[in-house]
Interface confidence: medium
């Protein structure tokens, strides 16, 4: 939404020109875009006041007419101080400047002649030093005279600029970069017949001046207001101007400060933090175990979160970042921490087999538990006859050879896994030895 860049109707209010290219000492860029890298120091962007109003001061001679006795008129000129003879109007108004005012209803221009006295304009009528009803992109010739100067008159060619509404000051800032950059560009939204070579653009943002159709300001502070004034000149005559106050977008939030994260139990963890200092909307908490990643959206007012349904004796890496939904979503840097959940009982061993290797010997095998849930790995086998424990063995692998059992006896074989902290549920099989074959 661009502001209307010109006064409506005929106006005598003058907007001061921005400093000229020569004043600004800003070299002209080869391209039509200038980029400025600034900082918060440029946050206060005030237009530089200036004026190019020219005032020509002449000392007017007073003329006295005296009648002589013969009746003939003798004109004697009394000079006050040292008065030069009248200049020609061509000389006096050689450097006349013009401002063009646009009437949006009639779509016609008024040329305001910047002179101190009310001049006459020959064929063209001019009222109060204004030439009315000029058509865009057409030349008009004005013959300027005044009783303070002599012939020849000043012939002023009015090179009328294009219509003001054909230009629009456009905010060309990329939304992704809107937190630290500003882009402004004059757009031609309708065609016109004026020579575009004669159009120059000028921007002033703070104390920076650019002679370009498009400007980019970079490295700005987020959430700061910046003011840029701009004007368009046609043959060095200003014909429209516009100002924009642009507020840079919210920046990425800072990184939260994690106070701690830890395992509270085998299936639970907790993380607490201090929020970042910059504005933000919510948090994203991600927790990664091995290659699995789960992420949660958390309310901005939270400073603690309890993680549930975690896997025992598993390393979890947590990342927490704040984000803000501005012109785009901006994510802050993620704070990281990690913990290992506490141990829990392992799951049951499986695929347990008991096979007889001889009359009084058995071979017991099983597969590891699906979930070890602890730091160590040990397999235990308990052999009972009736209610009596007859064997209790422990191996690194689930592979037990049980010898010297009694013949023709019912045995209960219990195999379980121990993870160093907890035993698992035993897998129980019953098997009997046979009568001795000999």
């Amino acid at each position: 939404q661009s502001p209307t860049p010109s006064p409506t109707g005929v106006s005598s209010v003058q907007t001061p020109h921005l400093p000229t290219h020569a004043d600004s000492q800003t070299p002209s860029a080869g391209t039509d875009t200038q980029t400025f890298s600034g900082s918060a120091a440029n946050a206060k962007l005030n237009p530089t006041p200036g004026s190019n109003a020219i005032s020509d001061a002449y000392l007017n001679a007073s003329e006295t007419t005296t009648l002589s006795p013969s009746g003939s008129a003798v004109i004697s000129t009394t000079t006050i101080a040292t008065t030069p003879s009248k200049p020609t109007c061509d000389e006096k108004y050689a450097n006349i400047t013009v401002d063009y005012l646009y009437n949006k209803e009639t779509k016609l221009f008024t040329a305001k002649l910047n002179v101190n006295e009310n001049v006459e304009c020959g064929n063209n009528t001019c009222t109060n030093n204004e030439v009315h009803n000029l058509t865009e992109c057409k030349n008009a010739s004005v013959s300027i005279s005044h009783n303070s100067c002599t012939a020849p008159d000043k012939t002023l060619i009015l090179d009328v600029p294009p219509g003001v509404e054909k230009f629009q000051l456009h905010d060309c800032t990329q939304v992704e970069k809107a937190d630290t950059t500003i882009c402004l560009k004059w757009k031609n939204i309708e065609t016109f017949t004026c020579d575009t070579q004669n159009i120059t653009y000028r921007f002033q943002c703070g104390n920076m001046i650019f002679d370009n159709k498009e400007i980019k300001l970079e490295n700005l502070e987020p959430e700061h207001e910046y003011k840029c004034d701009s004007e368009i000149l046609y043959n060095n005559h200003k014909f429209t101007n516009a100002s924009k106050i642009i507020k840079t977008d919210f920046g990425s939030p800072g990184e939260p400060q994690i106070i701690f994260c830890r395992s509270e139990a085998a299936h639970q963890g907790v993380i607490t933090w201090n929020p970042p200092q910059r504005s933000f909307h919510n948090f994203t908490l991600c927790y990664i175990k091995e290659t699995e990643k789960d992420c949660l959206n958390l309310d901005k007012n939270l400073i603690k979160y309890d993680l549930q349904n975690l896997k025992p004796y598993t390393k979890y890496v947590l990342s927490l970042h704040a984000y803000i939904i501005a012109k785009v979503q901006r994510n802050g840097s993620a704070a990281m921490c990690h913990f290992t959940t506490k141990s829990a009982p392992p799951s049951q061993v499986w695929n347990m087999t008991v096979s007889m290797t001889s009359d009084n010997s058995m071979h017991v095998k099983c597969r590891p538990p699906r979930d070890r849930n602890g730091p160590h790995e040990r397999y235990h086998l308990e052999v009972e006859a009736g209610n009596t424990l007859v064997r209790n063995e422990s191996h690194k692998n689930c592979d037990f050879r049980v010898k010297d059992l009694q013949y023709s006896t019912d045995y209960t074989f219990k195999a379980y896994f121990h993870n160093g902290d907890y035993p698992g549920e035993p897998f129980i099989l019953h098997h009997s030895t046979s009568y001795n074959s000999k």
Partner: antibody, heavy 119, light 107 residues
């Protein structure tokens, strides 16, 4: 085993500069937040600065803000402290310390390097 | 910033006796407090964090307690290697701050 070795200390005049380095080994450097902590002769401990794994979060004690800059090079397993505009009160043993993976406390410390600021 | 005040500044204890060290915070820090031990010429060593959780490899003779603003480190049955300076540290808010230290010396 985890090792942190500081270097770069020495005698410097007030207003001068020094750059401390800390070489880390025995652990995965790029997953740990790192800190500088100092101890003036015969005095207590003072936390100086903190840097996150990707250098995106950096904090300083008010006493060094604007004068000291912490940085890290994860490819080189190194932590740095650039100290400018040094003052007599910056004289101390500077320790490089690793934050635990889960809490902002320091589980491993270097042996320290002495910085003396004197004319 | 949060100020931690340790008391006493020096504690004289006979070997075999119990030592009780105090750390008071200027505002509530929940249980976000750690204790360190420092011997002459050495770097500090983490003993306790979370006010009461012993760090890896720290013997049970070191125990921490407290929450909010009042914290205690207890060393039961002091041995010669336990005579050192002990510091508390809060990590509830930036900047991180340490107490002034308590020197535990042989009586």
């Amino acid at each position: 085993q985890v090792q942190l070795v500081e270097s770069g200390g020495g005698l410097v005049k007030p207003g001068g500069s020094l750059r401390l380095s800390c070489a880390a080994s025995g652990f995965t450097f790029n997953v740990y937040y790192m800190n500088w902590i100092r101890q003036a002769p015969g005095k207590g401990l003072e936390w100086v600065s903190y840097i996150s794994t990707s250098s995106s979060a950096i904090y300083y004690a008010d006493s060094v803000k604007g004068r000291f800059t912490i940085s890290r090079d994860n490819a080189k397993n190194s932590l740095y402290l650039q100290m400018n505009s040094l003052r007599a009160e910056d004289t101390a043993v500077y320790y490089c310390a690793r934050r635990t993976g889960s809490t902002t406390v320091f589980d491993y410390w270097g042996q320290g390097t002495l910085v003396t600021v004197s004319s | 910033e949060i100020v931690l005040t340790q008391s006493p500044a020096t504690l004289s204890v006979s070997p075999g006796e119990r030592a009780t060290l105090s750390c008071r915070a200027s505002q509530s820090i929940n249980n976000n407090l750690a204790w360190y031990q420092q011997k002459p010429g050495q770097a500090p060593r983490l003993l306790i964090y979370g006010a009461s959780t012993r760090a890896t490899g720290i013997p049970a003779k070191f125990s921490g307690s407290g929450s909010g603003t009042e914290f205690t480190l207890t060393i039961s049955s002091l041995q010669s290697e336990n005579f050192a300076v002990y510091y508390c540290q809060q990590y509830n808010k930036w900047p991180l701050t340490f107490g002034g230290g308590t020197k535990v010396e042989i009586k």
